[in-house]
């Protein structure tokens, strides 16, 4: 009975040619969509002139199909029981699942102006930047299409900068025709309890972005976990989108298309300040914006983004400290819509449904030398967009799963 099932499961979740796991792992059978909501700034002039609160109105969803490409350069290493691969990136716009087109316009923070003023802190260099910003008729805010904002546009200000900067800017630029990795994960042949756990990422066991344990690459990529998942487990996974490892804890039992799954969620504790969660001390990288590491709910990933002041949070600053959202009007965080969850089938460890939600923000600071930032009286962590990446096992796959896995056990 149970031993036979365990044996079968152990055999089928190994990441090697011929197993159920491998087939679905190389190319996901699930349709994955990434929905974007853009924060359209309603009062750009008042903010720039009077340092007013930023009034935002979210517009979306704008939906793309993602993760439809098979893993590339899949290479088994029999010696250390690992398999390495690249995860190619691709996004296809889905008009029928969107409120508008990729040509829709939005008023958003000027990414180049905010980033350059942060990266180049020498006052004379800022004087030069100011001349170039003025010459290019750039400002603190800009109007961009969805396509430009996400996938890239040639920035007029950066085009005037002497060297050695790239003149194309976009929140996800470059994306299409790029790949994430190389990932090297354990295939589970020698030890099934290590299956899918990342051994190295880009050839390293550490990220080089954080101090101490924060820099570790822990767990899997969240697409699957080692089999026989217990409710008491803390599931570790690494997300290159947020440049860190994070964890999920059991929340509830869920029935997904007749399959019993465990819903694991990212707890608010994972986003807490070191005051509340001392383990998070190494995610606090500076003292000013974080108010001496007392702010919470935003993660400074600038070190991972070539110095650009990118901050990651949950949508609408869910689980963030009041000081973070105070300068922004129009946000309405709620757990149901804005938290991240994974629905895991406990026997196989496969993630059969998930919703990954995150928000991309950019820091903008006053600058006495840059005219368009001169009137600001405070720092703003400006929300640009939030995304909801979802995948659910298809009906056909669910039937197969019920008959071959859960049905046999019950």
């Amino acid at each position: 009975g149970d031993l036979l099932i365990q044996k079968t499961i152990k055999k089928q979740v190994v990441l090697e040619e011929g197993t159920i796991a491998f087939k679905n792992w190389v190319k996901t059978g699930t349709e994955v969509y990434r929905q974007f909501w853009i924060f359209d700034v309603q009062n750009p002039q008042e903010v720039m002139m009077n340092s007013s609160n930023i009034q935002v109105k979210q517009r979306g969803p704008y939906t793309y199909r993602v993760r439809f490409l098979a893993k590339e350069n899949v290479t088994q290493d029999a010696e250390d029981n690992t398999v390495s691969f690249l995860q190619p990136n691709g996004a296809i716009f889905e008009p029928s699942l969107s409120v508008g087109t990729e040509a829709d316009n939005f008023t958003v923070l000027n990414l180049a102006v905010a980033a350059a003023s942060h990266i180049y802190q020498n006052q004379f260099v800022q004087m030069i930047l100011n001349s170039l910003i003025n010459k290019s008729k750039s400002s603190m805010f800009q109007v961009r299409t969805l396509r430009e904002l996400l996938w890239g546009y040639r920035d007029p200000f950066l085009s005037l900068v002497p060297y050695p900067v790239t003149t194309t800017v976009g929140l996800f630029y470059p994306y299409n025709n790029t790949a994430d990795g190389v990932y090297k994960v354990f295939n589970g042949k020698d030890n099934i309890s290590k299956v899918a756990i990342i051994d190295t990422y880009k050839g390293k066991r550490n990220l080089s972005y954080w101090e101490s344990h924060c820099d570790m690459i822990n767990g899997t990529d969240a697409a699957s976990f080692p089999p026989f998942v217990e409710k008491s487990q803390v599931l570790q996974f690494f997300s290159s989108d947020i440049c860190r490892s994070i964890y999920a804890v059991f929340e509830s039992d869920v029935n997904l298309k007749g399959i019993p799954v465990y819903r694991f969620v990212l707890p608010s504790k994972a986003f807490a300040s070191p005051v509340e969660n001392p383990d998070n001390y190494c995610f606090c990288t500076e003292k000013i914006i974080s108010k001496n590491c007392t702010s919470y709910g935003v993660l400074d990933i600038s070190k991972c983004k070539e110095g650009r002041p990118v901050y990651i949070s949950l949508p609408h600053f869910l689980y963030a400290s009041p000081d973070v959202s105070e300068p922004i009007d129009g946000l309405n965080p709620n757990e149901e819509e804005h938290r991240t969850y994974l629905d895991i089938e406990p026997i196989t460890g496969f993630t059969l449904q998930f919703a990954k939600r995150l928000q991309v923000n950019l820091l903008v600071k006053p600058s006495e030398k840059i005219q368009v930032l001169k009137n600001l009286k405070r720092n703003y962590i400006v929300p640009i967009l939030w995304l909801n990446e979802t995948g659910t096992i298809g009906d056909e796959k669910a039937n197969m799963f019920r008959s071959q896995v859960t049905g046999k056990i019950n």
């Epitope: 942060h118 990266i119 180049y120 802190q121 020498n122 006052q123 004379f124 260099v125 004087m127 030069i128 001349s131 170039l132 010459k135 900068v161 002497p162 060297y163 500076e286 000013i288 600038s302 070190k303 110095g307």
Partner: antibody, heavy 119, light 112 residues
Framework: QVQLQQPGAELVKPGASVRMSCKAS????????MHWVKQTPGQGLEWIGV????????SYSQKFKGKATLTADKSSRTGYMQLSSLTSEDSAVYYC????????????WGAGTSVTVSS | DVLMTQTPLSLPVSLGDQASISCRSS???????????LEWYQQKTGQSPKLLIY???NRFSGVPDRFSGSGSGTDFTLKISRVEAEDLGVYYC?????????FGGGTKLEIK
């Protein structure tokens, strides 16, 4: 190769002004800042100021405001420093040097112009 | 202005020995973006200064690997692992993180 050429020496009278030049070659003149540095046996090396030839932006050390004026001529790829109301305190070697427009280290130096203020 | 204090003023060494020059700034010269513009220049008699090390520890092109820079915050060091005759001269530290940029007073490296 990358060079900054300066005249060797200038002899000037007290109260007068001097305009020294620094001719750049071997690189894109408007992509780099041009700095000027004073060296005296007593005071060591002192930064005077900087000009970005791309648009003429300048910045001066407080100590040299009113004393030094920096200009640049893009067509001749030459930077200039004018020193006014000269006194014996201004007798020194003056170097021009360059840095990237966004950087503050000096990778190329001129040979220096020796200024002597004497009646 | 940021004061850069170099020690020692004069450093007598035997050829082949290691030399170490210290530089201390009166305040932190780490910019908010994490970059530290701390450089080391060498000046030989009758010549203009030459860049050796930039941004604390990066050797400028053509500089022999016996020269190395280290430090953080306010304390920085230039090391010459095996002094050669051509290394004699005056060494200056320099900070470019704050305006105005400032030089240290110099350390004269001479033969014992």
């Amino acid at each position: 190769q990358v060079q900054l050429q300066q005249p060797g020496a200038e002899l000037v009278k007290p109260g007068a002004s001097v305009r020294m030049s620094c001719k750049a070659s071997g690189y894109t003149f408007t992509n780099y800042n041009m700095h000027w540095v004073k060296q005296t046996p007593g005071q060591g090396l002192e930064w005077i100021g900087v000009i970005y030839p791309g648009n003429g932006d300048t910045s001066y050390s407080q100590k040299f405001k009113g004393k030094a004026t920096l200009t640049a001529d893009k067509s001749s790829r030459t930077g200039y420093m004018q020193l006014s109301s000269l006194t014996s305190e201004d007798s020194a070697v003056y170097y021009c040097t360059r840095s990237g427009w966004d950087d503050w280290f000096f990778d190329v130096w001129g040979a220096g112009t020796s200024v002597t203020v004497s009646s | 202005d940021v004061l850069m204090t170099q020690t020692p003023l004069s450093l007598p060494v035997s050829l082949g020995d290691q030399a170490s020059i210290s530089c201390r700034s009166s305040q932190s010269i780490v910019q908010r973006n994490g970059i530290t513009y701390l450089e080391w220049y060498q000046q030989k008699t009758g010549q203009s200064p030459k860049l050796l090390i930039y941004k604390v520890s990066n050797r400028f092109s053509g500089v022999p690997d016996r020269f190395s820079g280290s430090g953080s915050g306010t304390d920085f060091t230039l090391k010459i692992s095996r002094v050669e005759a051509e290394d004699l001269g005056v060494y200056y530290c320099f900070q470019g993180s704050h305006v105005p940029p400032t030089f240290g007073g110099g350390t004269k490296l001479e033969i014992k």
